[in-house]
């Protein structure tokens, strides 16, 4: 019979590190409707690909100071008479000096440094949400050619490339999230605790699933990365006939729990409690909050029926999670 849970542990995790994630089960296919938000591609995830930016700069290097057609004489004064007929083409001038890549890099860095300074004036809060890792990796060979006194410049380059080019902060990419609904009605006997399972991914605008870890059959969501997860569950509950047709007693209640590793007492859990003495035959109970999940820990939804009558959790009840950050 259901028991009131004890306060959860606040200490470091007690569970052993889980093994490798189990193979995706029959309820875990990744296919979904086009209505769901697409997985951003690498190009969309970063505002600028550093290699492309550099190559573009090098390709443009025959313009400006490296232009092939630049005049080597001093600038001519403008005359504002009527234009005469075009003259014959002049002889090919001698080739200008080739500016080495190091100088180009220096010029590139100075341009970027100016852009960074300009952005800093516009945006006092530096953007730290960009995925700097991949950018740093692809810039490493470039920064190696710069002198050690250019470290701050390289840092500015990284900052610029890692941040969005458009002014204003950008929301970080959500790496893990889902919204699923209960596929069929679930009967919960009186004085019983039931783990909800057999979900489906709604084929509807605004529904989403990103990243692995959700087992639709078992109802368990295994955290793909360690971090803070916002979790929510909303159950639509229909009361069955109480035994001996008596009304719900004052102590009759439901507890909705989202628990880590199916250990609702000794791990942190989210909990909502609802008395049944004044409930209608059909009602909703919800719980939401934030839990820190270690990579590989699973979380799932439980309904603790501490009442004298059986009840049915209606299909369409839902469970969702979003990774907030690490």
């Amino acid at each position: 019979s259901p028991e009131p849970g004890a306060p959860s542990r606040s200490r470091a995790r007690r569970e052993p590190p889980p093994g490798n994630e189990l193979p995706r089960g029959p309820g875990e296919s990744r296919a979904g409707p086009a209505a769901r938000p697409p997985e951003p591609t690498a190009e969309r995830a970063h505002s600028v690909d550093p290699r492309d930016a550099w190559m573009l700069f090098v390709r443009q290097s025959d313009k400006g100071v490296n232009g092939k057609k630049r005049s080597r004489g001093k600038a001519k004064k403008l005359k504002f008479g009527l234009p005469g007929p075009p003259g014959p083409p002049g002889p090919q001038g001698p080739p200008g000096p080739i500016i080495p890549p190091e100088a180009l890099l220096k010029e590139f860095q100075l341009l970027l440094k100016g852009a960074v300074r300009q952005r800093e004036r516009a945006e006092p809060e530096p953007c730290t949400c960009g995925p700097a890792g991949p950018v740093a990796a692809s810039l490493a060979p470039v920064s190696a050619t710069a002198g050690e006194d250019d470290d701050d410049v390289v840092g500015d380059v990284l900052a610029l490339l890692a941040a969005p080019l458009a002014p204003g902060p950008r929301a970080p990419r959500v790496e893990a999230a889902f919204l699923c609904r209960l596929r069929r009605d679930a009967l919960v006997e009186r004085r019983a605790l039931h783990e909800l399972g057999v979900y489906y991914l709604p084929d509807a605008e605004g529904a989403f699933r990103r990243g692995p870890g959700l087992n639709l059959t078992s109802g368990q969501y295994r955290a793909p990365v360690a971090g803070f997860y916002a979790l929510a569950a909303t159950l639509h509950v229909a009361l069955g006939e109480p035994p001996r047709r008596g009304p719900p007693r004052p102590r009759d209640h439901l507890r909705l729990l989202i628990c880590i590793q199916s250990r609702c007492q000794r791990n942190a859990s989210l909990e909502a409690i609802m008395g049944l003495e004044s409930s209608s035959e059909l009602f909703t109970i919800s719980v939401n909050g934030v839990l820190y999940l270690q990579m590989g820990q699973w979380t799932s939804v439980f309904l603790d029926n501490a009442s004298g009558c059986s009840l049915t959790v209606r299909s369409g009840s839902h469970f969702s999670a979003v990774l907030l950050g690490v």
Partner: antibody, heavy 115, light 106 residues
């Protein structure tokens, strides 16, 4: 109602292996941890290990690593413990028990299997 | 490993007595302590979980107390059916049982 029904007593020779079973009924087998506990004649209880049938995660008491191996069969709602390389030290009663989700204590116990 | 010590291995008391059984952990176990009753026929039942919470169906004459590393089980009005061996168990780090306290009638 919740029940854990264990297999009958076993008489085995030293060096042999034995597999004892624990059939669960009256609840969703895959949602609860199953623990195994050893009790030598006239002595106390000694925790061996647990298994979570929902994903077959296990955790062992260091002392029983290599001695006990836990498995679970979802289709028959049965947990198993295999004991290998048996010696007289392994003569005991072995209990399976269910860990309650909200109590995280062993709320239902099998009747024990004597080895 | 956390060791659990029940210093009294056997205890005699009269019916109606108030009986207290103690249990000590080798370190702070943050109230993750449970009590079990094992009857002479070998059957084991949960009495108290999380130090002081009475498990469903257990008579209210049983109560639990303690904190840190010291815990106790009290039977306020001893009855014949309470004759059994009582074990404490910590669930703070892995699982460990105490050696047990056998309760007898004087």
């Amino acid at each position: 109602q919740v029940q854990l029904q264990q297999s009958g007593p076993e008489l085995v020779k030293p060096g042999a292996s034995v597999r004892i079973s624990c059939k669960a009924s009256g609840y969703t087998f895959t949602s609860y941890y199953i623990h195994w506990v050893k009790q030598r004649p006239g002595q106390g209880l000694e925790w061996i290990a647990w298994i979570y049938p929902g994903n077959v995660n296990t955790e062992y008491n260091e002392k029983f690593k290599g001695k006990a191996t836990l498995t679970a069969d979802e289709s028959s709602s049965t947990a198993y413990m295999q004991l290998s390389s048996l010696t007289s030290e392994d003569s005991a009663v072995f209990f399976c028990a269910r860990e309650g989700i909200t109590t995280n204590a062993l709320d239902y116990w099998g009747q024990g299997t004597s080895v | 490993d956390i060791q659990m010590t029940q210093t009294t291995s056997s205890l005699s008391a009269s019916l109606g007595d108030r009986v207290t059984i103690s249990c000590r952990a080798s370190q702070d176990i943050s109230n993750y302590l449970n009590w079990y009753q094992q009857k002479p026929d070998g059957t084991v039942k949960l009495l108290i979980y999380y130090t002081s919470r009475l498990y469903s169906g257990v008579p209210s004459r049983f109560s639990g107390n303690g904190s840190g590393s010291d815990y106790s089980l009290t039977i306020s009005n001893l009855e014949q059916e309470d004759i059994a061996t009582y074990f404490c168990q910590q669930g703070h780090t892995l699982w460990t049982f105490g050696g047990g306290t056998k309760l007898e009638i004087k």
